[in-house]
Amino acid sequence: FNISGCSTKKLLWTYSTRSEEEFVLFCDLPEPQKSHFCHRNRLSPKQVPEHLPFMGSNDLSDVQWYQQPSNGDPLEDIRKSYPHIIQDKCTLHFLTPGVNNSGSYICRPKMIKSPYDVACCVKMILEVKPQTNASCEYSASHKQDLLLGSTGSISCPSLSCQSDAQSPAVTWYKNGKLLSVERSNRIVVDEVYDYHQGTYVCDYTQSDTVSSWTVRAVVQVRTIVGDTKLKPDILDPVEDTLEVELGKPLTISCKARFGFERVFNPVIKWYIKDSDLEWEVSVPEAKSIKSTLKDEIIERNIILEKVTQRDLRRKFVCFVQNSIGNTTQSVQLKEKRG
């Protein structure tokens, strides 16, 4: 087919010789076709991954990728000739860096749905260069980890040595979807969840007097977990006194939040203090009432068949412990008046 009508985009991949890194090309088809094929939905920052807009069935791999040999030979089907390049939906993944990846890549719809579609194609001129700038020793890695439950940030490797003030406008993608609100060289994550994991792409434009290029870098982001550095905290009971009716049954609940520990041995128990004596009470088994990747809430109840006068003189103590330390909360019973 005739590629002279294809829209053209120039991209630059500057790779570090010290690291394994990947690269991607998106099939950015011109507008009305995009809706049929690889439309990247805009993503609001509040959206949770379960509610991400997924590509429709007619998007899947309805594009064909070719490479244009520099010697003028016919276009080559990427899938047949290049084992280190993988097509995933409308994205081309380069698994290994190297100047031999330089060249022209063309994508177009597989199914021609209208006469207009014949000219619907994108030509991407990719230039691949090894990184020569040694002045930036601590440039961001192409593999970045975010600690679950904490704050974190994802840096654009090609811009990480520039201050925010001098950084150009950056376009970010996550798993091929545009992150429309992100424009700086760093994405700040207020609280890390497991859905922040994925493949992030950052683009910015570099111009000289002759032409302009899109400089692109790919970052693989993992969400990782680490042991808590905090002892458990007791969520309930909050008050240290509890109004009760004598002669009536009573259940006091102790709920505690335990931070993540790789080897998890939580302790939650009730004991009673009566003047100088104290003893552990045999109570129903503890149960987990909420478990997340970051922490777990465990509940254990003490049950009194009926509240007696003697119980009003006692302190009921909930004791919780993890490998870091322990916390207690005591409750004094008080007779309800009126």
Partner: antibody, heavy 124, light 107 residues
């Protein structure tokens, strides 16, 4: 790129204590677990134990009575001490970053970065 | 301790072949399994975690599957650089244990 480098004596006498240090460069020791693994000549891999950067440890029960793993976050290093060694402790000792990946609503642990290994021979 | 048994212990294959290595756990370990590749005189290299998730940068000819007690590592089309020893490893319970290894040789 995070890199790990083991260091320590290559020869230890029986009944003495084997001491190795692993230096982490190109990244922080914080937020990760750090493991020691060994491989006797011509054999498979055996996990010795791990330490979290905060100091929490977990050891292989088969070695627990003889093993101590410690961490020095200021130097970006963690260390292994194995007491009362015998010829059976002769092996290549590796240090590795041991990471818990939170994905698919669960945790998956993996040793994703390894040192190149150091050979320790126990002999008089 | 959970025991992991790999089979076969060694196998010979040619470039371009499809190869499958299995790892059986002595009790259920859900998906808490990783695969490593080790070449002579080198440290192991991590390939797969969570039984089936490929580490970024690992060629897509490697794939993992399985859950519970039976797991497989498949190399769809062997390349010269794939000849090595492969280990499975479980993280489901402590102590962490490895399989005895499968040595993959050139036929």
């Amino acid at each position: 790129q995070v890199q790990l480098q083991e260091s320590g004596p290559g020869l230890v006498k029986p009944s003495e204590t084997l001491s190795l240090t692993c230096t982490v460069s190109g990244g922080s020791i914080n937020n990760y677990y750090w493991s020691w693994i060994r491989q006797p000549p011509g054999k498979g891999l055996e996990w010795i134990g791990y330490i979290f950067y905060s100091g929490t440890t977990n050891y292989n029960p088969s070695l627990k009575s003889r093993v101590t793993i410690s961490v020095d976050t200021s130097k970006n290093q963690f260390s292994l001490k194995l007491s009362s060694v015998t010829a059976a402790d002769t092996a290549v000792y590796y240090c590795a970053r041991d990471v818990g990946i939170a994905a698919r609503n669960s945790y998956y642990y993996v040793m994703d970065v390894w040192g190149q290994g150091t050979t320790v021979t126990v002999s008089s | 301790a959970i025991q992991l048994t790999q089979s076969p212990s060694s196998l010979s294959a040619s470039v371009g072949d499809r190869v499958t290595i299995t790892c059986r756990a002595s009790q259920g370990i859900s998906s808490a399994l990783a695969w490593y590749q080790q070449k002579p005189g080198k440290a192991p290299k991590f390939l797969i975690y969570g039984a089936s998730s490929l580490e970024s940068g690992v060629p897509s000819r490697f794939s993992g599957s399985g859950s519970g007690t039976d797991f497989t590592l498949t190399i769809s089309s062997l390349q010269p650089e794939d000849f090595a020893t492969y280990y499975c490893q479980q993280f489901n319970s402590y102590p962490i244990t490895f399989g005895q290894g499968t040595r993959l040789e050139i036929k």
